[in-house]
Structure formats: structure tokens, C-alpha cells
Interface confidence: low
């Protein structure tokens, strides 16, 4: 779940609403109850018939999904609505990058040793913001209302609990989980931060305040400079309220605007290959701004020709994005797989 291993995650929303994987039992690796097929659940509230455009990912399959904004993906396990007819799915790959897991907190000593606090309006981001402000790397939410701060060294001695133990709804947000009884849901504080300098070979950048909705009048910048001569960005989530909420991508060296996306003009679905080694991302929201925001993964490319469409060109220093640009490259049968 680290921000530096985004390729391992199938989910980028805190409640797994974007899960489109193929787990079809309530437990991982064949454990748990088998799920019913969504096209055979018309007697229930949710079925493929209630999702004709596939917006929620329902269809002629029995994969776990979250069509109703619940706290995590789930599925129906029984035909009738007597007793337990649905269950949450425990999907190890469905945790947003930056979520480090569910940890045991016995309280003596606490799993995260830094400052703590409680709030009847606790959300994941409220805790992240608190710990960020205190200068800590990690934030942990517990029992729906408690927030703890700590550092990587705390986790080294921490004990992982089953993911399903962190099942308590945050007091401040019905669509988020905030740990459990004696269980701490731990996040990296860089999630939803308003600034950052990203130099790891790959990673994830979230909109400010994520996983909460971004707030009004936000003006945030992130510098990307992973090793390599070029960059690849992939938007995993993009929901801006209107055209006045805008994300700009600029070449860090020249300040040249490479592209701007906004609520009316979202990014395309595929990876953006940018022939610049250093990128500046700027996000601005207007006075009304409130929406889920964005999550994007990036990875450094060794050269700007790591592009399946790019024919080999004559040697020239890459500094701006373009498929098929003349850049120095070595022969290769095809581009490497995405991270």
C-alpha cells in the first residue's frame, strides 16, 4: 500500500468504489463465501440492470464491487434478504496507495508513539492533516474517532491485523473507515497533501484533502523529478467540480504549460508520456470547489522513446512531451509494461 508501489494497488479511492478487479469471493485467495452474479440479483437493490452504463462496474459477473458508496467493496451471498445476504469483501489489492494497513494497537505502548487526539468529526484527512502539521510521517485512525501520529520506526515493531478488523466508519464521513477497536488504520501523511517534492522512481499524487473532497480556494503544487529522462502519468481518478477547478502540468525547467485539465476537460484514459524529466503539477480550485479530486500514478522512464507509438528517431535531447519525437533511444521490440 505504499505510495511508492502504486502498481500493486487496484484501488485509488478510500472505499474501493473504483475496484474493477476479479475477486469473486468474500475472502482472498479462494477464502470466504462465493459471490452471486450481479445479473442474477434483480430481487436485491443492486444488479446489472440497475447499472446499465456500467458506472459502478456491475455486469454479467460475480466480482466484488461497491455500487452504493459503502465503505468497501461487497457482494451478495444469498438469493433472499433473510439473514446475512451480503458481505464485505476482503481484497488485499484494494487499498489505496498510501494506506499501509490495519495494525494492532494494544495501547501499551501505542502502535504510533507520537501525539494523538480525538474528534467527533474525524475523517482520514482530518487525521492526516493533524499529523502532517505535527511533523510526523504517519497517521493512524482508530475506533472511528481517534487519531495517532508516528514514524516509520513505529511500524517496524507493529503487528499487522486482518484488513477486515479496520471496519469502523469514521465519525465524520460515512464513506470512510477509521480503524477498529484496538485497530489502527495507518496512512502516509503525504496522501492529500497540498505540496510535495517527488523523486522516487514511481509514486502516486492525490488531490489536496484526499480522500476527503478537496476544499475551496486551494492552490497546490507538486514537483516531480524521478530518475530518468521522461515521465509517464496515468490518471486513476479524476473528478473536478467545474471548469474553474484546474490541474496544470508544466515543464519544471522552462515553465512551459504542457496541458491543463479541468472539470469540463478531464484527461484521457491512457498513460501520458511526457518527454521531460522534471514536471510541476499545480492544482487550483475556486471558491465553491468541492469534489472527489484526482489520483494519478507516475513513473520515471529511462528515455522519452519508451512509447509504443514512437518510431526511432535521430538523437536529440528530449525536453518536451511528444510521441514519436526525435530522441536518442536504443532498439527495443516494445515498450516495457506499465508499473
Amino acid at each position: 500500500g505504499s505510495l511508492h508501489s502504486p502498481g500493486l494497488s487496484e484501488c485509488f479511492q478510500v472505499n474501493g468504489a473504483d475496484y474493477r478487479g476479479h475477486q469473486n469471493r468474500t475472502g482472498p485467495r479462494g477464502a470466504g463465501r462465493p459471490c452471486l452474479f450481479w445479473d442474477q440479483t434483480q430481487q436485491h437493490s443492486y444488479s446489472s440492470a440497475s447499472d446499465p452504463h456500467g458506472r459502478w462496474g456491475l455486469g454479467a459477473h460475480n466480482f466484488c464491487r461497491n455500487p452504493d458508496g459503502d465503505v468497501q467493496p461487497w457482494c451478495y451471498v444469498a438469493e433472499t434478504e433473510e439473514g446475512i445476504y451480503w458481505r464485505y469483501c476482503d481484497i488485499p489489492s484494494c487499498h489505496m496507495p498510501g494506506y499501509l494497513g490495519c495494525f494492532v494497537d494494544s495501547g501499551a505502548p501505542p502502535a504510533l508513539s507520537g501525539p494523538s487526539g480525538t474528534s467527533t468529526k474525524l475523517t482520514v484527512q482530518v487525521c492526516l492533516r493533524f499529523c502532517r502539521m505535527k511533523g510526523y510521517q504517519l497517521a493512524g485512525v482508530e475506533a472511528g474517532y481517534a487519531c495517532f501520529c508516528g514514524s516509520e520506526s513505529d511500524l517496524a515493531r507493529g503487528r499487522l491485523a486482518p484488513a477486515t478488523d479496520c471496519d469502523q466508519i469514521c465519525f465524520g464521513h460515512p464513506g470512510q473507515l477509521c480503524g477498529g477497536d484496538g485497530r489502527l488504520g495507518v496512512y502516509e501523511v503525504s496522501v492529500g497533501s497540498c505540496q510535495g517534492n517527488w523523486t522516487a522512481p514511481q509514486g502516486v499524487i492525490y488531490s489536496p484533502d484526499f480522500p476527503d473532497e478537496y476544499g475551496p480556494d486551494r492552490n497546490c503544487s507538486w514537483a516531480l523529478g524521478p530518475p530518468g529522462a521522461a515521465l509517464e502519468l496515468t490518471f486513476r481518478l479524476f473528478e473536478l467540480a467545474d471548469p474553474r477547478d484546474r490541474l496544470e502540468l508544466r515543464d519544471a525547467a522552462s515553465g512551459s504549460l504542457l496541458r491543463a485539465f479541468d472539470g469540463a476537460r478531464p484527461p484521457p484514459s491512457g498513460p501520458l508520456r511526457l518527454g521531460t524529466a522534471a514536471l510541476l503539477l499545480t492544482f487550483r480550485s475556486d471558491a465553491r470547489g468541492h469534489a472527489q479530486g484526482f489520483a494519478l500514478t507516475y513513473r520515471g522512464l529511462q528515455d522519452a522513446a519508451e512509447d509504443p507509438e514512437a518510431p526511432e528517431g535521430s538523437a536529440q535531447t528530449p525536453a518536451a512531451p511528444l510521441d514519436g519525437a526525435n530522441v536518442s533511444c536504443s532498439p527495443r521490440p516494445g515498450a516495457p509494461p506499465a508499473a
Partner: antibody, heavy 119, light 107 residues
Framework: QVQLVQSGAEVKKPGASVKVSCKAS????????MNWVRQAPGQGLEWMGD????????NYNQKFKGRVTMTTDKSTSTAYMELRSLRSDDTAVYYC????????????WGQGTLVTVSS | DIQMTQSPSSVSASVGDRVTITCKAS??????VAWYQQKPGKAPKLLIY???YRYTGVPSRFSGSGSGTDFTLTISSLQPEDFATYYC?????????FGGGTKVEIK
């Protein structure tokens, strides 16, 4: 290889509408914006707007707002540009043009569709 | 909208000549300028992007320079196939706008 193939020439009367198609191949259609650019006889190039095929969201040049509609059909990898209330000064060659991977120029163009508006 | 003013509107030159075309933006567009070549009855072809980067397959005799508001396309040694109309375009913000074009004719 990337190809954009447009529909044939059209002759229309003033006040009518025209719908030009642009069939894309050789790349993942939903991964790139499709732009529409027109060129009146002997004149320069004028950007009309673009469409994001993945979301179906479009962005129009203010000059054409209210008269132009851009759509896509993902199943056939085809983009469409409809221009309504045609006037004689809409006589032009209409091009579809695909964005580059980095969005810094129009890397691929259709062959163009001549639309003649005449009474 | 950002205006792109190209000059000259036409130029007569001979094979082997050095040809320079300029483009002035009505406001700062950083290096967000592309250059296209268009021959009669054909679609434009991308030559230069981000002011100075040659697109794939474009001969090295074509070069671009400039930033801010002033940009230049240079053909170092004009070849017979280079007689065409050339357009600059800013992609700094929406809507992208083109210059009026420069026709390079045989002297």
C-alpha cells in the same frame, strides 16, 4: 500505424447542417483527444474544438459554441463533428486531428472533408 | 484568445537558400509553439513542437527557436520539396490559435 479517415465531400444549402465523420485506427481511440480544425479556401487554420473520447466531454472554440457538436462512437473508434445553421462562410475543408501523446501539437491529421455551402 | 502574427506572409527563395519565418504571440506563451508545413490539397504536417523540438522524420534543416512572444522557424538550405505554406500555432492555452501562414515560393 495511426490513420484518420474522414467522410467524403458535402454540398449543403445555407441554414442546413453537416455531420463529418473521422474513423481512427492504429491506436487506442479513447487515449487521445480528437480535435477539429477548419480551413476556408485560401485561408489559414482555425481550431473549432476537441473531444475527449473516453469521457465524451468536449471543449469548443467560443466562436462556434451553440452551432457545433462533437461526438464519438467508441465502438467504431469514430469521431463526429456536426455544424448547424450553415452559412456561406462555413465553406471550408474540415480536418480531424489527433493530439500527440504529450499534447503539444497535432501529430496526426485526417485527409480533410470539403464542405461547400451554397444556395 | 492569443493572437499569433506571422511574417512575412510570403517569401520567394531559391533552392539552397536559408529561409527564416517569424511568429509573434500577443502574450507570453513560454515555449508552447508548434510549426506545421502544408502543401496544396494536403493536411498540415507537424514539423516542430515546443518551439525547438523536431518531430519524427523531420529533416535536420528545419529548426525552431524562441520563447515568450517571439518565435522563429528556419530552413537552413531550402530543398525543392520545401516549397509550401508554413503555420505557427500556440498550444499554451485554449483555444489553440494559428498564425496566418507564410507561403514559401520559388523565386
Amino acid at each position: 500505424q495511426v490513420q484518420l479517415v474522414q467522410s467524403g465531400a458535402e454540398v449543403k444549402k445555407p441554414g442546413a447542417s453537416v455531420k463529418v465523420s473521422c474513423k481512427a485506427s492504429g491506436y487506442t481511440f479513447t487515449d487521445y483527444y480528437m480535435n477539429w480544425v477548419r480551413q476556408a479556401p485560401g485561408q489559414g487554420l482555425e481550431w473549432m474544438g476537441d473531444i475527449n473520447p473516453y469521457y465524451g466531454s468536449s471543449n469548443y472554440n467560443q466562436k462556434f459554441k451553440g452551432r457545433v457538436t462533437m461526438t464519438t462512437d467508441k465502438s467504431t473508434s469514430t469521431a463526429y463533428m456536426e455544424l448547424r445553421s450553415l452559412r456561406s462562410d462555413d465553406t471550408a475543408v474540415y480536418y480531424c486531428a489527433r493530439d500527440s501523446s504529450g499534447y503539444v501539437g497535432f501529430a496526426y491529421w485526417g485527409q480533410g472533408t470539403l464542405v461547400t455551402v451554397s444556395s | 484568445d492569443i493572437q499569433m502574427t506571422q511574417s512575412p506572409s510570403s517569401v520567394s527563395a531559391s533552392v539552397g537558400d536559408r529561409v527564416t519565418i517569424t511568429c509573434k504571440a500577443s502574450q507570453d506563451v513560454s515555449t508552447s509553439v508548434a510549426w506545421y508545413q502544408q502543401k496544396p490539397g494536403k493536411a498540415p504536417k507537424l514539423l516542430i513542437y515546443s518551439a525547438s523540438y523536431r518531430y519524427t522524420g523531420v529533416p535536420s534543416r528545419f529548426s525552431g527557436s524562441g520563447s515568450g512572444t517571439d518565435f522563429t522557424l528556419t530552413i537552413s538550405s531550402l530543398q525543392p520539396e520545401d516549397f509550401a505554406t508554413y503555420y505557427c500555432q500556440q498550444h499554451y492555452n485554449t483555444p489553440p490559435t494559428f498564425g496566418g501562414g507564410t507561403k514559401v515560393e520559388i523565386k
